[in-house]
């Protein structure tokens, strides 16, 4: 049985101040400029050094932004998202669900075609290659005696 | 990164006329919202104008409105300051600055190092 990748998805509300820099972020999505199939929801495409999402440190590439200072991020274009968080305030508040990455089924068994599944060939090969090593290593050993 | 290079300032008597322009090192400049800024001499950096990156949203401040217009080539990589009706107080150094499109701020995270425009 192939093992499938899940995801475990959690929501959270983070509250930033504009620094100097503003938000220190960038966003993709809307219904004009679908990210996700079938979603047009607003994602986080880049965060920004030293920005004020980067120096708090919770809102994370690829966070979904729910809603901003209570507001609906759904079925917005994305011109109309941008202006939206660019007259936000001083004070903003964002509602965030953050997908986290979870492996179910066994240990090296990923779906097809999920990069982040380790090839059984990869595993075998070293493997191999150790047990030759230390097989020729005994040999010589041997023969020392 | 993005650099920005201005040019086309000059002495100019008032009442004449100057196209500025802002020249980015970018191939993907029209993904870039572009504003154009002066600072007079003894005065702080003050806002002129801005355009989006398709070049369908153009502002200026008022003091300029009616004299001062915006335009973008993206295939050209350039932006334009078209400047009429110059008057001396117009005179400062002009800075082009871009930001991405889709950046959640107003600030500018690119600026070109500024031409000098004299108005007599």
């Known amino acids: 049985m192939n093992g499938r990748v899940d995801y475990l998805v959690t929501e959270e509300e983070i509250n930033l101040t504009r620094g100097p820099s503003g938000l220190g972020f960038n966003i993709v999505g809307g219904t004009d400029q679908q990210y996700v199939s079938n979603d047009s929801g607003i994602y986080v495409s880049r965060i920004k050094e030293n920005g004020a999402a980067a120096l708090d440190g919770r809102l994370q590439e690829g966070d979904k932004i729910l809603s901003v200072n209570g507001q609906d991020l759904k079925n917005l274009l994305h011109q109309d998202a941008v202006d939206l968080f660019r007259n936000a305030g001083y004070a903003v508040s964002l509602r965030v669900q953050h997908r986290l990455q979870v492996q179910n089924g066994p240990i090296g068994h990923r779906g097809e075609g999920d990069p982040s599944g380790i090839p059984i060939f990869m595993v075998l090969v070293p493997v191999f290659a150790l047990t030759m090593v230390a097989a020729w290593a005994f040999m010589r050993y041997r023969q020392q005696l | 990164d993005v650099q920005l290079v201005e040019s086309g300032g000059e002495l100019v008597q008032a009442g004449g006329s100057l196209r500025l322009s802002c020249e980015a090192s970018?191939?993907?400049?029209?993904?870039?919202?572009v504003g154009w800024f002066r600072q007079a001499p003894g005065k702080d950096r003050e806002f002129v104008g801005s355009?989006?990156?398709?070049?369908?949203?153009?502002t200026v401040v008022n003091s300029v409105m009616g004299r001062f217009t915006i335009f973008r080539d993206n295939p050209k990589k350039t932006v334009y300051l078209q400047m009429t009706s110059l008057k001396v107080e117009d005179t400062a150094v002009y800075y082009c600055?871009?930001?991405?499109?889709?950046?959640?701020?107003?600030?500018?995270?690119?600026w070109g190092q500024g031409t000098q425009v004299t108005v007599s």
């Open positions: 970018t191939g993907t400049f029209g993904d870039y919202d």
């Open positions: 355009i989006n990156w398709s070049g369908d949203r153009r």
């Open positions: 600055a871009a930001r991405f499109r889709s950046s959640v701020d107003w600030q500018y995270d690119y």
